[in-house]
């Protein structure tokens, strides 16, 4: 999906209003310095591409974040403010249902969500130069 045509200001407002708080809740009990940010993004469409990938694609050691509250809200925000996003996700959602696993918070998942927090922060500051 090409995130170029999303309403970035609305997605930012959704993040600041509620998604950010859910990410903090997920990470509660973890020191903010515990993980290094290794994933970066260069502009808002790129940030959303990376956010979608880290949130919804299973990775080694973290099978699924998709049923977490922050993930459900992320999916909803993209569906509302990225034209045509919902239609592209129908097949992906059906595939995800087949391989759904029980929720387990592993250290790898915590690291992944820490990366997500960094991507979201970067999304909210699009005019900053890349380090």
């Amino acid at each position: 999906y090409d995130f170029t045509n999303c309403d970035f200001e609305k997605i930012k407002a959704a993040y600041l209003s509620t998604i950010s708080k859910d990410l903090i809740t997920y990470m509660s009990g973890t020191k903010s310095t515990e993980f290094n940010n290794t994933v970066s993004c260069s502009n808002r469409p790129h940030c959303l591409t990376e956010i979608q990938s880290l949130t919804f694609n299973p990775t080694a050691g973290c099978a699924s974040l998709a049923k977490e509250m922050f993930a459900m809200k992320t999916k909803a925000a993209l569906a509302i403010w990225c034209p045509g996003y919902s239609e592209t996700q129908i097949n992906a959602t059906q595939a995800m249902k087949k391989r759904r696993k029980r929720k387990v918070t592993t250290n790898k998942c915590l690291e992944q969500v820490s990366q997500l927090q960094g991507l979201w922060r970067r999304f909210n500051r699009p005019l900053l130069k890349q380090q």
Epitope: D7, K10, A13, A14, L16, S17, T18, M72, K73, K75, A76, A77, A79, I80, W81, S86
Partner: nanobody, 132 residues
């Protein structure tokens, strides 16, 4: 240009009723979500009730569930808030607000409808005072 005009506020005794109206113009009403917000002195603006003019889906704040009813007349481009069993704590300025994409994505909007930062268009507000 987009205009939202509220009316129907006033002074009412506890236990009484009021019906607020929000008349809209300047946009495709049928696709929009309209939400009633309220703001009491010294408090944050809070979402009270949402309606999608696209499919009629409604959401309510827990504090008003069972007492307030939101409805829409698409032919008149007007949204109503029927407020029954009013309490002194309902005293506030009531605003209606419109958003263009939450109307056609009402199920996804369950997470976001009550956050004022997501709305583009606002009315000027109408005062509701409930005396004890």
């Amino acid at each position: 240009q987009v205009q939202l005009v509220e009316s129907g506020g006033g002074l009412v005794q506890a236990g009484g009723s009021l019906r607020l109206s929000c008349a809209a113009s300047g946009f495709t009403f049928d696709d929009y979500a309209i939400t009633w917000f309220r703001q009491a002195p010294g408090k944050e603006r809070e979402g009270v009730a949402y309606i999608s003019n696209f499919d009629g889906m409604t959401y309510y704040a827990d504090s008003v569930k069972g007492r307030f009813t939101i409805s829409s007349d698409n032919a008149k481009n007007t949204v109503y808030l029927q407020m029954d069993s009013l309490k002194p704590e309902d005293t506030a300025v009531y605003y209606c607000a419109a958003e263009g994409r939450m109307g056609t994505h009402s199920r996804d909007s369950v997470y976001f409808w009550a956050f004022s930062a997501l709305y583009d268009h606002w009315g000027q507000g109408t005062q509701v005072t409930v005396s004890s």
